[in-house]
């Protein structure tokens, strides 16, 4: 009765071979399935084998695989062979390792987190780098300070707001001595206090594909920065956008499928359907970023009756323009972010 | 054999936090779901939280909802339970158990939170 | 959820005679596996449960075959050919067909 994500113990029947070194077949046509999917562990796809034939409980890392029983893919799991050499019939589940990321003149590991300077916190994934600001650029209310302005203080790595009062003599910005913020590693719990601050969410960590963006949030019970993130797809991979450009235009700022679809995330199926737009791409150096979006809360059903919800971006509009002509200056979509209010909602 | 061992149940005042552990041991951890169940004294079994084998996929009841957070250390073999804004309705034993696939096949023996003021 | 109701809530019974227990959910509790995951539990006065029955009829390891399960769709029943004293306590069951698991109220046996 013990449960295990996928069997740890494969009872594989090849077809019988001529020649007993040769490969075994594990796919059989016409297909045989049983007459009803399994059920699977908690965590684990329910996917169609590689035989194309029947349902089954994807390979976790460290299972056995074969062109039948395959990995799971949307754990980035693929079959590693290389220890049933010469045959390469049975494999074993390994991670695929994602494609590092080099900035300025430092590799960084895929997954790796990391901080190239003070004022920022990033990640590599899949060699792309995304990074989400450790100042936190919270405006003092007008109420208590009409006149703020941003200084440099020697020793601290984040600007620090303060105050110009009437008799123009600077004070810092938050009331009761309760310090100005900095970077987030010395935010402390404000209680009372507590000045609520959103940051906006940081660039889709893909140019196309499902990518993650983050943003970091103190509107919680202690008032301490957490890190939020919500599931961004800024384009399809596999749609030549430039393709679909206007004759005598330079740009398509915003593709939209025609048919609606429903989003898919580790083998489970969004509840209902969508007509996203996405971002397009220009023939020049520009690119396309959104500039009017929100975040969705989609809803996911499962093969096994489960379901949960992840929360989403949800393009509105998009704009192109130069500020992404270098694409290893990480930080110049950061920098402009905060200027474009709709993006942080 | 499979072992699990409940431990951090006390007492604890109303709003205040506690967190759980669950050490286990005889098996590998790191391919079950893992569940933590409640009993409020005399009365009956009362499911908590799920989390999968890696932690990827995790449920909760609706009582326990945005206040308490299942997680879990594969490399430790250790299943955790962080109790938020408890209330006196959540004092009960809080047993840790392994999931068997639309079953539950092994139990901690137990560990008793209180919240009273 | 699925509610899962037990009876009687409490059942005396003489040492040696059959006891019988039922339990009824509110929905199917067929998987789309073919399985029915309906469990039976057992808890001893001051210990933890133990499960009994899995998937309607299948015992555990170590469990009396006096114990026995059957049922299907939504009516389930435990039953105890001939009573012991060791099986006083309260009998659970359980559904894992839908998310979340959910249990009836327990029924208590005891000895008359």
């Known amino acids: 009765t013990a449960l295990s994500p996928a069997p740890t113990t494969m009872d594989f029947t090849p077809a019988p071979l001529e020649d007993t070194s040769s490969r075994p077949q594990f796919c059989k046509w016409p297909c045989e399935c049983p007459p009803s999917p399994p059920r699977c562990p908690l965590g684990v796809s329910l996917i169609t084998d590689g035989c194309e034939c029947c349902k089954m409980c994807a390979q976790q890392l460290g299972d056995n695989c074969t062109e039948a029983a395959i990995c799971d893919p949307h754990r980035g799991l693929y079959c590693d062979y290389s220890g049933d050499r010469p045959r390469y019939a049975i494999g074993v589940c390994a991670q695929v390792v994602g494609v590092g990321c080099v900035l300025d003149g430092v590799r960084y590991n895929n997954g790796q987190s990391f901080q190239p300077n003070c004022k920022y916190n990033c990640t590599c994934i899949d060699g792309a780098v995304g990074c989400t600001p450790l100042c936190l650029r919270v405006r003092p209310p007008r109420l208590w300070c009409p006149h703020p302005r941003r200084v440099s203080i020697p020793g601290h790595c984040c600007e620090q707001w303060v105050c110009e009062d009437d008799a123009k003599r600077p004070r810092k910005t938050a009331p009761r001595d309760t310090g100005a913020f900095d970077a987030v590693g010395e935010v402390e719990a404000w209680h009372r206090n507590c000045i609520a601050y959103t940051s906006p969410w940081s660039p889709c960590s893909t140019s196309c594909g499902l990518g993650v963006s983050t943003r970091i949030s103190n509107v919680n019970a202690q008032c301490w920065p957490e890190q939020e993130s919500r599931l961004c797809n800024l384009r399809p991979c596999d749609v030549d956008i430039h393709t679909l450009i206007k004759a005598g235009k330079k740009c398509l700022a915003v593709y939209q499928p025609e048919a609606s679809m429903n989003f898919t995330l580790a083998g489970c199926i969004s509840t209902r359907s969508y007509q996203p737009k996405y971002c397009g791409v220009c023939m020049d150096n520009r690119c396309c970023i959104p500039y009017k979006s929100k975040t969705i809360d989609v809803s996911f059903q499962c093969p096994d009756g489960l379901g949960f919800s992840r929360q989403v971006l949800w393009i509105n509009a998009c704009f192109c323009n130069l500020s992404c002509r270098n694409p290893n200056d990480i930080f110049a979509d950061l920098e402009s972010y905060p200027d474009f209010s709709e993006i942080a909602n | 054999q499979v072992q699990l061992v409940e431990s951090g149940g006390g007492v604890v005042q109303p709003g205040r936090s506690l967190r759980l552990s669950c050490g286990a041991s005889g098996f590998t951890f790191s391919r079950f779901a893992m569940h933590w169940v409640r009993q409020a004294p005399g009365k009956g079994l009362e499911w908590v939280t799920v989390t999968s084998f890696d932690g990827s996929e995790i449920y909760y009841a609706d009582s326990v909802k945005g206040r308490f957070t299942i997680s879990r250390d594969n490399s430790k073999n250790t299943l955790y339970l962080q109790m938020n804004s408890l209330r006196v309705d959540d004092t009960a034993v809080y047993f840790c158990?392994?999931?068997?696939?639309?079953?539950?096949?092994?139990w901690g023996q137990g560990t008793l939170v209180t919240v009273s003021s | 959820d699925v509610v899962m109701t037990q009876s009687p809530l409490s059942l005396p019974v003489t040492i040696g005679q059959p006891a019988s227990i039922s339990c009824r959910s509110s929905q199917g509790l067929v998987y789309s596996d073919g399985n029915t995951y309906l469990n039976w539990f057992q808890q001893r006065p001051g210990q933890s449960p133990r499960r009994l029955i899995y998937?309607?009829?299948n015992r555990d390891s170590g469990v009396p075959d006096r114990f026995s399960g059957s049922g299907s769709g939504t009516d389930f029943t435990l039953k105890i050919s001939r009573v012991e004293a060791e099986d006083v306590g309260v009998y659970y069951c359980?559904?894992?067909?839908?998310?979340?698991?959910?249990f009836g109220q327990g029924t208590k046996l005891e000895i008359k």
């Open positions: 158990a392994r999931d068997a696939l639309g079953s539950i096949d092994y």
């Open positions: 998937k309607v009829s």
């Open positions: 359980m559904q894992g067909t839908h998310w979340p698991y959910t």
